[in-house]
């Protein structure tokens, strides 16, 4: 196996509506034509897969039905949102990339991206 | 090519410490990829022990030796290392060094034997 | 944890022989690699990706399989492939081994 560059952003801040979004960037050694990216959470000391996705150079992501987890590529840039998130998901998002074909395989792992998540507070009552 | 030499191993009294080495060459521990350590106790299968991240902030442990063992790295000599503290006779294996893509253990060390008996 | 239990535990078999090696994970898992090690040496990647073949490996070493159930077969087994084989799963930490199939000369 050959070591690839993986690159994401330190930190991002949920949106009230619990999505996150952030690019995970690869410096691909070569002309990939199959590309798997995997986010794994960080949290507690653990590593857990979220979401993966296979894909072709050119192709829009395919997750599977019930993922969490939506994305784009554009070159060697992968545009990941995940949504569905609650304060508790809070942790540390990893993008795994590898190059899965043509051969020689590729991998290569990013430093994680600090995802905080903050559960909106709710709406007071109202009384009109 | 990337070349992992393992050394420190040894023989150590029960609640005993030792400090494992793994030299890497061929390839900066900081670039990339998880680094590992693995044992197996003779005549055993292998074991999983600890990883830590490439930019050194992450750290994970078996929880047979949470609390007992340290992964850390020092980036300037390339080298990852293992704190083994308060020793137990089942910590008894070789311990080898890997570079880790999540389970995907690709290069390894050839492995330094730890002992520990009174 | 993830437990992986490997079937069978050991088996005799002749040079020549296709043999098969089950790997079960106790739930669902996208990545399973297959590693194969000589006494007294480190373990050596064979199969990652379930079925992907790692650079230099011959091409008698196939893998197969999803979910929860994995297979690593020799198509024809060759003297230098007797050792024990091991299954890793990496969906979760603590990355976990399955306990090995020793291949043994018949």
């Known amino acids: 196996c050959k070591a690839m560059h993986v690159a994401q952003p330190a930190v991002v801040l949920a949106s009230s509506r619990g999505i996150a979004s952030f690019v995970c960037e690869y410096a691909s050694p070569g002309k990939a034509t199959e590309v798997r990216v995997t986010v794994l959470r960080q949290a507690d000391s653990q590593v857990t897969e979220v979401c993966a996705a296979t894909y072709m150079m050119g192709n829009e992501l395919t997750f599977l039905d019930d993922s969490i987890c939506t994305g784009t590529s554009s070159g060697n840039q992968v545009n990941l949102t995940i949504q569905g998130l609650r304060a508790m998901d809070t942790g540390l998002y990893i993008c795994k990339v590898e190059l899965m074909y043509p051969p020689p395989y590729y991998l290569g792992i990013g430093n994680g991206t600090q995802i905080y998540v903050i559960d909106p507070e709710p709406c007071p009552d109202s009384d009109f | 090519e990337v070349q992992l030499v393992e050394s420190g191993g040894g023989l150590v009294q029960p609640g005993g410490s030792l400090r494992l080495s793994c030299a890497a060459s061929g390839y900066s521990i900081t670039s990339g990829y998880y680094w590992a350590w693995i044992r197996q106790a003779p005549g055993k299968g292998l074991e999983w022990v600890s990883s830590?991240?490439?930019?050194?902030?992450?750290?994970y442990y078996a929880d047979s030796v949470k609390g007992r063992f340290t992964i850390s790295r020092d980036n300037s000599k390339n080298t990852l290392y293992l704190q083994l503290n308060s020793l137990r006779a089942e910590d008894t294996a070789v311990y080898y060094c890997a570079r880790d893509g999540f389970g995907y253990f690709d290069y390894w060390g050839q492995g330094t034997l730890v002992t520990v008996s009174s | 944890d993830i437990q992986l239990t490997q079937s069978p535990s050991s088996l005799s078999a002749s040079v020549g022989d296709r043999v098969t090696i089950t790997c079960s994970a106790s739930s669902s898992v996208s990545y399973v690699y297959w590693y194969q090690q000589k006494p007294g040496k480190a373990p050596k990647l064979l199969i990652y990706?379930?079925?992907s073949l790692e650079s230099g490996v011959p091409s008698r070493f196939s893998g197969s399989g999803s979910g929860t159930d994995f297979t690593l077969t020799i198509s024809s087994l060759q003297p230098e492939d007797f050792a024990t084989y091991y299954c890793?799963?990496?969906?979760?930490?603590?990355?976990?081994f399955g306990q090995g199939t020793k291949v043994e000369i018949k």
């Open positions: 890793v799963q990496g969906l979760q930490t603590p990355w976990t």
């Open positions: 830590i991240s490439g930019s050194g902030s992450t750290t």
């Open positions: 990706d379930a079925s």
